[in-house]
């Protein structure tokens, strides 16, 4: 009689992460007497997968009737597949005896496990830059196999191409890593701009994982400052405006200053929002002229976002204006922004 | 669901013999290798054999070989474990298990004179 | 025969501690035969850990298994009242098969 054979017919499968795995393997003969074993990998370090008569394999069931005396399909099922399950499985006949011995084994199947990566997580500067800076932001997904993968960052659609990326670990390994870097210059117009990191695997059907970063987050455009005098609004007053343009984000602290000395220190509230996401504010100061005898430097004052100050100055002719005799009474505030300097 | 029940308590005087059964359910007693454990009083678990009930092969470890045989009625789906030449270090409780995951709730072996 | 030695032989701690509990074969030992159980009084062992390191069903993750060769180790990373037992490894290697003495985990 012809000696038994152990066949493992599949070289090699793959299975997506979660399903089962289904590993065939059929003997050409019932003799010698003896059990099957799963084994994956082999050598010494061999792990048992599963053993017919003993031991607990919750994961492990036999596809036919395997314990009938004349069975020779000693094929299996493992459930619940994860990345770790990768590897060479062997069907192994033993003769039985004290102990058992092995007999012959068949000529194993590649398990390989598909998995998915994770969400792709962006993450931009811990502190904000300015506009004409290049920042820096990391994507970083893992948990997928096989180690193949593509990655691709954008920036409001437009692909970017300065980034470099690294899959680890480089060699084999249950499932991959992937961790790349991309350089943004940042420009006035990004406060509502998006980075996407885009990444395709085999496991998502042509249908890529996206992570986006906002560039709200990560930009900061500093103000413009223009301080003007406005019309005579009634004798001897002055109306002074700080208009304050083009800021991101809205943290603003304004303070006016009277030949050097703080007048009034106020937090910008009351913003206009403009198309590309920047705020506008203004401040004004009304001014009563016949209270000085000498010319008045007032300074527009701004501390945005907790940057050192920066600062416009408007020279107030006070000669210009003729002074009323014995008078230093205030004018009457009419407006929340208002000061009136003596 | 899978059962394993023993036979009830035993006293026996030392010299004689005692055969415990096994009776199992949810399964079919052939697929699996039926194991022996011995728990003296205080004491810890020691394996004293196994058999394989789809042939009657058996092992048994060194200590209890020559006075303990395993068989299996595999038409009742039971298991026995017969131990003689009983002396009184051998009173302790008896599990049978399936492969070594599902265990009988024990059998308690008094040796006494 | 492999002899199974478990360390310590008590092992006294307070619920919210880590408990480790060690296992040495006098020769090695495949880790898929490794099996931990746990035994309480006057009940039979239940399995608790199969493969060195697979936690039987219904066993809390807060049980977890390691070791190759002939070092091997049962840690519980935050002892809840139910976990104090008796805990046994055993070793199907090779005939005869062992049981290590057992380890008692009690209150402090």
């Known amino acids: 009689e012809e000696e038994l054979q152990v066949i493992q017919p599949d070289k090699s499968v793959s299975v997506a992460a979660g399903e089962s795995a289904i590993l065939h393997c059929t003997v050409t003969s019932l003799i010698p007497v003896g059990p099957i074993q799963w084994f994956r990998g082999a050598g010494p370090a061999r792990e048992l997968i599963y053993n017919q008569k003993e031991g607990h394999f919750p994961r492990v069931t036999t596809v036919s009737e395997s314990t009938k005396r004349e069975n020779m399909d000693f094929s299996i099922s493992i459930s619940n597949i994860t990345p770790a399950d990768a590897g060479t499985y062997y069907c192994v006949k033993f003769r039985k005896g004290s102990p058992d011995t092995e007999f012959k084994s068949g000529a194993g199947t590649e398990l390989s496990v598909r998995a998915k990566p994770s969400a792709p997580v962006v993450s931009g500067p811990a502190a904000r830059a300015t506009p004409q800076h290049t920042v820096s932001f990391t994507c970083e997904s893992h948990g997928f196999s096989p180690r193949d993968i593509t990655l691709k960052w954008f920036k409001n659609g437009n692909e970017l191409s300065d980034f470099q990326t690294n899959v680890d670990p480089v060699g084999e390994s249950v499932s991959y890593s992937i961790h790349s870097t991309a350089k943004v210059v940042l420009t006035r117009e990004d406060v509502h701009s998006q980075v996407i990191c885009e990444v395709a695997h085999v496991t998502l059907q042509g249908d890529p994982l996206r992570g986006t970063a906002n560039l709200s987050e990560t930009i900061r455009v500093p103000p413009t400052l223009e301080v003007t005098q406005q019309p005579v609004r009634a004798e001897n007053q002055v109306n002074v405006t700080c208009q304050v343009r083009k800021f991101y984000p809205q943290r603003l602290q304004l303070t006016w200053l009277e030949n050097g000395n703080v007048s009034r220190t106020e937090t910008a509230s009351t913003v206009t929002e403009n198309k590309d996401g920047t705020y506008n504010w203004m401040s004004w100061l009304l001014v009563n002229v016949s209270a000085h005898r000498d010319d008045v430097k007032l300074t527009c004052q701004v501390e945005h976002d907790g940057q050192p100050a920066v600062s416009k100055s408007h020279d107030l002719k006070v000669s210009a204006h003729p002074k009323e005799q014995g008078s230093n009474t205030a004018a009457e505030n009419t407006g929340s922004n208002e000061r009136n300097i003596y | 669901e899978v059962q394993l029940v023993q036979s009830g308590a035993e006293v026996k005087k030392p010299g004689a013999t005692v055969k415990i059964s096994c009776k199992v359910s949810?399964?079919?007693?052939?697929?699996?290798?039926m194991h022996w454990v011995q728990q003296a009083p205080g004491k810890g678990l020691e394996w004293i054999g196994r058999?394989?009930?789809?042939?009657?092969?058996?092992k048994y470890a060194p200590k209890f070989q020559g006075r303990v045989t395993i068989t299996a009625d595999t038409s009742t789906n039971t298991a026995y474990m017969e131990l003689s030449s009983l002396r009184s270090e051998d009173t302790a409780v008896y599990y049978c298990?399936?492969?070594?995951?599902?265990w009988g709730q024990g059998t308690l072996v008094t040796v006494s004179s | 025969e492999i002899v199974l030695t478990q360390s310590p032989a008590t092992l006294s701690l307070s619920p919210g501690e880590r408990a480790t509990l060690s296992c040495s074969a006098s020769?090695?030992?495949?880790?898929?035969?490794l099996y931990w159980y746990q035994q309480k009084p006057g009940q039979a062992p239940k399995l608790w850990i199969y493969?060195?390191?697979n936690l039987a069903s219904g066993i809390p993750a807060r049980f977890s298994g390691s070791g190759s060769g002939t070092d091997y180790t049962l840690t519980i990373s935050s002892l809840e009242p139910e976990d104090f037992a008796v805990y046994y490894c055993?070793?199907?290697?090779?005939?005869?098969?062992?049981f290590g003495q057992g380890t008692k985990l009690e209150i402090k």
């Open positions: 949810g399964f079919n007693i052939k697929d699996y290798y």
């Open positions: 020769s090695s030992v495949s880790s898929s035969y």
């Open positions: 493969s060195t390191s």
């Open positions: 058999i394989d009930p789809e042939d009657a092969e058996t």
């Open positions: 055993h070793q199907w290697s090779s005939y005869p098969y062992t």
């Open positions: 298990d399936r492969g070594l995951a599902y």
